[in-house]
């Protein structure tokens, strides 16, 4: 029987060129956690095995870093990057929690305000 | 269920090398991670290297990075650990591990044995 829950961010948001912490939290349970994946939508950006360490895909390797923990940073966010997050911890012997994040990056104060503080 | 084989071992000089293989079973080989470990006579197991993403990730224990490779070739179902610069303190028996979505856990094979000496 599956008696964990997941606490997460939940509904966060960041200046693009930022960078922000994407976190999960497994509790209640006394399962042991065997991996944690990171997904974007249907793409696997990172995963964290407990035998055998941290991946990041390729495609995100230069803008995801793995931690703190089992969270997830993301780097030099653009505005595609906003968009739901699911962290999926794989326990034995209870099978996959899965917890969701949504991030939504924001044009930064620069960018905005910018163009009124241009110099003559 | 997810079945590991790993083959390769065997003696070897100090400077010498060897690769090791590691057979799995199971539809799941191409996304998962995998890597591998080994355990010296009278010492905990240690983790040595693994690998995701068909070889664009990998990470290496410091004290076999530069000397050892690690690979895989998902139409085989197999991951192979070339061991070059063998030393001594290699000697080990080497076990291949890979996460298993059957049952939630890592699989782990039953370990080949490398006996580095002259």
């Known amino acids: 029987m599956m008696t964990g829950t997941i606490e997460t961010t939940g509904n966060i948001s960041a200046e693009k060129g930022g960078s922000i912490i994407l976190q999960c939290h497994l509790s209640s349970t006394t399962a042991q956690v065997t991996q944690v994946n990171w997904e974007q939508q249907d793409q696997l950006l990172a995963i964290c095995n407990a035998d055998l360490g941290w991946h990041i895909s390729p495609s995100f390797k230069d803008r995801v870093a793995p931690g703190p923990g089992l969270g997830l940073t993301l780097q030099s966010l653009t505005v595609n990057d906003t968009g739901e997050y699911f962290c999926i911890y794989h326990t034995y012997p209870d099978g996959t929690y899965t917890g969701r994040i949504f991030l939504e990056v924001l044009e930064s104060s620069v960018a905005e305000h910018g163009a009124r503080f241009q110099i003559p | 269920e997810v079945q590991l084989v790993e083959s390769g071992g065997g003696l070897v000089q100090p400077g010498g090398s060897l690769r090791l293989s590691c057979a799995a079973s199971g539809p799941t080989f191409s996304t998962n991670v995998m890597g591998w470990f080994r355990q010296a006579p009278g010492k905990e197991r240690e983790f040595v290297s693994s690998i995701h993403w068909g070889g664009s990730s990998t990470v290496y224990a410091d004290s076999v990075k530069g000397r050892f490779t690690i690979s895989a070739d998902n139409s085989k179902n197999t991951a192979y650990l070339q061991m070059n610069s063998l030393k001594p303190e290699d000697t080990a028996v080497y076990y291949c591990?890979?996460?298993?979505?059957?049952?939630?856990?890592?699989?782990w094979g039953q370990g080949t044995l490398v006996t580095v000496s002259s």
């Open positions: 591990v890979t996460y298993s979505a059957y049952d939630f856990r890592n699989a």
